[in-house]
Amino acid sequence: KKVVLGKKGDTVELTCTASQKKSIQFHWKNSNQIKILGNQGSFLTKGPSKLNDRADSRRSLWDQGNFPLIIKNLKIEDSDTYICEVEDQKEEVQLLVFGLTANSDTHLLQGQSLTLTLESPPGSSPSVQCRSPRGKNIQGGKTLSVSQLELQDSGTWTCTVLQNQKKVEFKIDIVVLAFQKASSIVYKKEGEQVEFSFPLAFTVEKLTGSGELWWQAERASSSKSWITFDLKNKEVSVKRVTQDPKLQMGKKLPLHLTLPQALPQYAGSGNLTLALEAKTGKLHQEVNLVVMRATQLQKNLTCEVWGPTSPKLMLSLKLENKEAKVSKREKAVWVLNPEAGMWQCLLSDSGQVLLESNIKVLPTW
């Protein structure tokens, strides 16, 4: 017998064709011989089956000898053998209805697990293969699990259910709730204004939550809460802000903070957490601040950086348009008795300048 696969909630059309290309009498029955529908002349008649309100046919096709059974809003329990009786013949069609759902919300926090559950009719032995938006394939039976969801897992998951050499495809939209960047680093000269941005990697119509930025200054022994805030839709409202530094926060998404000036005592690492309503767990973004200061004290020209720098970063002092006088993988460099002119302090990574501060050395008479 013919096998047709259907998807829960969808509509399926089971075909039944007579040899005569004209409207003749037909009946559709289920495996219990209960009449589903048929015709009486040009009228559609329905039987006492549980499909009554969801079953239909296409009268426009009857004259061509086609008598389809249309079942709307398919349910798993609609899986059955359906029999079309026409011209003293019986055509059997086995309908198997499958459902695939994410057993939790389809909006999941980065790092959480996604479980897809297959609903299938008794006696079936389907296999499932799912392809993630980043092209990763996972296979399984009744359940498929993906642990440690990543940002790239956001999007449409395409799952193929295979049964009796037939296949049916499901598409499930998954939204991974995360910040666009897990970590960022800001390089500033002392006194410059600092901007921290925390763009979200998703858009949700209604977004409610609360957040906090904790800061561990390099010079401090413990971390400190710099700001707490609430989020409602795109509206951001500050609840509490530390007096030093006096941060300012944008009143709408994307989350954005401004530090009036970069100072050595602020250099360090921060962790912005965002707890979303009706979600367990929090979103995190790390932010780092590196501050540079160039000073001249008597006969000593010094350049220093504070904050989380990697060991491969190079700190240099050079007179403008000349070779570096001093260059070290350290957080402070100096030149004694510097000659007059415009000196540059450079923080660089593999030749790329990350931060630069200029200081003018006047001639000594």
């Epitope: 609430d230 795109k234 509206e235 409202s237 300012q248 944008g250 009143k251 709408k252 954005h256």
Partner: antibody, heavy 118, light 107 residues
């Protein structure tokens, strides 16, 4: 059509009080931030106060803190500004304004005049 | 509070002229800046949001640009109905602050 209509302005003595109202129509009032902006004679625009429809949070300019209170009655689609301890420098046309979905003041009323004078 | 400095405070121009008004914020405000037009005795009219997004119904001769601290409103070819006072507004954070205004007068 979105409409805002201010009322309640008038002449008041220094130290006195006044309550301004702004009747809104043509949009879902409770969904939006509403604000008051004033303009002294011959001067520029001066933001006074805002209130969120979603959270009820209120924000005031330093010059009016402790003297003016913004409030709203979502069931009546009305915004209020309770002004007390009025000073000469509060003399202005007071405009009611509605924020759009991106939190910019997009629709303004015609204004109501408040004169503080002895 | 964030200060908004608008310049010039007034300018004289002729119909067909290209007019540029600048606005500077005392600190970075992303692109959270709006522009408004006001005619005598009338309420302000919203022209531009997010520094450069023209509101529906606003003629395309108006344009805005900028990010961070420096912003510009340009009228490419001044029309008689454009003679008015223009204000910038920082909408980054509370308190909201306006520039002091630029009056565009007929030369």
């Amino acid at each position: 059509e979105v409409q805002l209509l201010e009322s309640g302005g008038g002449l008041v003595q220094p130290g006195g009080s006044l309550r301004l109202s702004c009747s809104a129509s043509g949009f879902t009032f409770s969904d939006y931030v509403m604000s008051w902006v004033r303009q002294a004679p011959g001067k520029g625009l001066d933001w006074v106060s805002s209130i969120s429809g979603l959270t009820g949070n209120t924000y005031h300019a330093d010059s009016v803190k402790g003297r003016f209170t913004i409030s709203r009655d979502n069931s009546k689609n009305t915004l209020y500004l309770q002004m007390s301890s009025l000073r000469d420098e509060d003399t202005a046309v007071y405009y009611c304004a509605k924020d759009n979905e991106d939190y910019y003041m997009d629709v303004w009323g015609k204004g109501t005049t408040v004169t503080v004078s002895s | 509070a964030i200060q908004m400095t608008q310049s010039p405070s007034s300018l004289s121009a002729s119909v067909g002229d290209r007019v540029t008004i600048t606005c500077r914020a005392s600190q970075g405000i992303r692109n959270d800046l709006g522009w408004y037009q006001q005619k005598p005795g009338k309420a302000p009219k919203f022209l531009i949001s997010a520094a450069s997004s023209l509101q529906s119904g606003v003629p395309s001769r108006f344009s805005g640009s900028g990010y961070g601290t420096d912003f510009t409103l340009t009228i490419s070819s001044l029309q008689p109905e454009d003679f008015a006072t223009y204000y910038c507004l920082q909408d980054y954070t509370y308190p909201r602050t306006f520039g002091q205004g630029t009056k565009v007068e007929i030369k």
